[in-house]
C-alpha cells in the first residue's frame, strides 16, 4: 500500500498579479519631476505610493490608487463592494506548518488555526510556505490580532495590519494605513512634507543587501541603511539626493522636538 502525501501546496492563486507588468518594480525614471503615482508591490500584494520622475519608467505606474487596485489586484472590485466587517486574516495564516525542503533548523513562528495563536516551529531554511514569520510579534500582528485600518472597504492586505504594541506613543494615519509613530520622531504637526518621511527606516523582509537612504525627521538628514530587497516602507531612497529632495522640504526646523539617541 502506498502512503498518500497530504496536499499542502500553497500556490496562492489569489496572490498572483493580473498582468505581468504588475510584477515590475516601481521605476521612478531618470527625470527630476516629483509626481505622486502608485504601483503594485508584488511582495506586499498591495498598491503603494511612489514618486515618479516624469519620464520613462515602466507600465507599473498609475495616477490613482483605485486604478492601480483595479488593474493589479485580483478580485479587487468584488472585494471593494463588501461592507467593512472588521479585520480579516490573510489566507496564508491558515496554511499548515511546513518546515520546507531544507534542514537548517531556524527558529520561526506560525499561526496555528486550531489554537488561534502564533507558535514557534522549526523551519528548515528553504521552500516552506508563507505562514512563516521571523518574530512572534510579526506573526501576531498579521495573523493573531490584525488591526484593521480605518478604510471604507475591507481589503485583506499586508499593510492593513500593524503592531498593537505598548511602546507606541503616537499613531497617525498615512494613506489609510495606521502607522505607529516612534517617540523619537517629531509629531505630524511639526512636519509639513510627505507622510512617509516620518516612518522609521525599515529593512524589509527579503534576502538582499542593498544600500539605501532614509530620511530622519529628527535630524533633518538622510542616512544610509541596509535594505533587504522587498517590503519595508516608502522612506527608502536609492540616493541621498533623492531622499533629501523628497523629504527635506517638509521639516519646520524650529518646531522639531526629535532627539537622536
Amino acid at each position: 500500500l502506498s502512503e498518500e502525501a497530504d496536499d499542502t501546496d500553497s500556490e496562492l492563486g489569489s496572490m498572483k498579479p493580473l498582468h505581468t507588468f504588475c510584477a515590475m518594480k516601481a521605476d521612478d525614471g531618470p527625470c527630476k519631476a516629483m509626481i505622486r503615482s502608485y504601483f503594485f508591490n508584488m511582495y506586499t500584494h498591495q498598491c503603494e505610493e511612489f514618486i515618479y520622475g516624469g519620464c520613462e519608467g515602466n507600465e507599473n505606474r498609475f495616477d490613482t490608487l483605485e486604478e492601480c487596485k483595479k488593474t493589479c489586484i485580483p478580485g479587487y472590485e468584488k472585494t471593494a463592494v463588501k461592507a467593512a466587517s472588521g479585520a480579516e486574516r490573510p489566507d496564508f495564516c491558515f496554511l499548515e506548518e511546513d518546515p520546507g525542503l531544507c534542514r537548517g533548523y531556524m527558529k520561526r513562528y506560525l499561526y496555528n488555526n486550531q489554537t488561534k495563536q502564533c507558535e514557534r516551529f522549526v523551519y528548515g531554511g528553504c521552500l516552506g510556505n508563507r505562514n512563516n514569520f521571523e518574530t512572534l510579534d510579526e506573526c501576531k500582528k498579521i495573523c493573531e490580532n490584525p488591526v484593521h485600518s480605518p478604510s471604507p472597504v475591507n481589503e485583506v492586505q499586508m499593510s492593513d495590519y500593524v503592531t498593537d504594541g505598548n511602546t507606541v506613543t503616537d499613531r497617525s494615519t498615512v494613506n489609510n494605513i495606521v502607522v505607529p509613530q516612534s517617540p523619537k520622531v517629531p509629531r505630524r504637526r511639526d512636519y509639513r512634507g510627505r507622510p512617509w518621511c516620518l516612518q522609521p527606516a525599515d529593512s524589509g523582509l527579503c534576502k538582499a543587501s542593498e544600500r539605501r537612504f532614509y530620511y530622519n525627521s529628527a535630524t533633518g538628514k538622510c542616512h544610509r541603511f541596509n535594505y533587504t530587497g522587498c517590503g519595508g516602507n516608502n522612506n527608502n531612497f536609492t540616493t541621498r539626493r533623492r531622499c533629501l529632495r523628497s523629504c527635506k522640504t517638509g521639516l519646520i526646523k524650529n518646531k522639531s522636538k526629535g532627539v537622536v539617541k
Partner: antibody
C-alpha cells in the same frame, strides 16, 4: 551511494495517464534529510520541475502550477520508491522524465538523478 | 515565478583556457545570512544532469576545483579556470528561493 532506477512505459496515448516509478537504493523515501522530485526535459521547455514530496513529521508535497490539476506524486514506503502520475496527457507532455533526490541536509540541491525515461505521447 | 536567464546560450571553448557562464535571476536569491539559493548543474551528452555547485559557491563532492561559483543578489557566475575536454555539455543554473523551482535555459559548452 544513492541510486535511482526509473521504470515505466515510453509511449502513452493522448488523454491517458502517464505513470512512472522511481526505485531508491542507498536511502529511504521516508528519510527526513531528503526530498523526492520529478523533473522533465524537452527541447521546447528545457528542464521543468514538476513536483516534490518529502517526509518530516508527516508527508508534504508541492506541485508546479502548470501541471497541478493533473499530477500526483506518491511515496511507497513498503517498496522504497515513489511514483509520478500525470493525467490527461497531450503531445505537449512528450519529454524525458527524471526522478531526482533533493539533499535537504548539506547541499540543498538535486544531488542524485535517475537515468531518465523518454515518454512520447502519441496515438 | 522566478525567471532564470543564462548567457551565453552557446560557448565554444579552447582546452586549457578559462570559461565563464552568467546566470541572472528575476529576484534576489541571497538570504540575509549570506546563503545563496542557487545551484549549478552539468548535463554531459547522453547523461542525466549532475550537481556541480550548491548554495552558489560550494563544490559538490567529486567536482574538480577548476569549477567555481560566485555572485550575489541576482547576478551569478560559474567559472571554469582551465577547460578540459570532459567539461563539454550543457550547464544549468537553478533557484530554490521559492516555488516553483526553476532552471535557466542552459549554456552549451563545446570545444572549438
Amino acid at each position: 551511494q544513492v541510486q535511482l532506477q526509473q521504470s515505466g512505459p515510453g509511449l502513452v496515448k493522448p488523454s491517458q495517464t502517464l505513470s512512472l516509478t522511481c526505485a531508491i537504493s542507498g536511502d529511504s523515501v521516508s528519510s527526513d534529510s531528503a526530498a523526492w522530485s520529478w523533473i522533465r526535459q524537452s527541447p521546447g521547455r528545457g528542464l521543468e520541475w514538476l513536483g516534490i514530496i518529502y517526509k518530516r513529521s508527516k508527508w508534504y508535497n508541492r506541485y508546479a502550477v502548470s501541471v497541478k490539476s493533473r499530477i500526483t506524486i506518491n511515496p511507497d514506503t513498503s517498496k522504497n520508491q515513489f511514483s509520478l502520475q500525470l493525467n490527461s496527457v497531450t503531445p505537449e507532455d512528450t519529454a524525458v522524465y527524471y526522478c531526482a533526490r533533493w539533499d535537504s541536509d548539506k547541499m540543498w540541491g538535486f544531488d542524485d538523478w535517475g537515468q531518465g525515461t523518454l515518454v512520447t505521447v502519441s496515438s | 515565478d522566478i525567471v532564470m536567464t543564462q548567457s551565453p546560450l552557446s560557448l565554444p571553448v579552447t582546452p586549457g583556457e578559462p570559461a565563464s557562464i552568467s546566470c541572472r535571476s528575476s529576484q534576489s536569491l541571497v538570504f540575509r545570512d549570506g546563503t545563496t539559493y542557487l545551484n549549478w548543474y552539468l548535463q554531459k551528452p547522453g547523461q542525466s544532469p549532475q550537481l556541480l555547485i550548491y548554495k552558489g559557491s560550494n563544490r559538490a563532492s567529486g567536482v574538480p576545483d577548476r569549477f567555481s561559483g560566485s555572485g550575489s543578489g541576482t547576478d551569478f557566475t560559474l567559472k571554469i579556470s582551465r577547460v578540459e575536454a570532459e567539461d563539454v555539455g550543457v550547464y544549468y543554473c537553478q533557484q530554490y528561493d521559492s516555488y516553483p523551482l526553476t532552471f535557466g535555459q542552459g549554456t552549451k559548452v563545446e570545444i572549438k
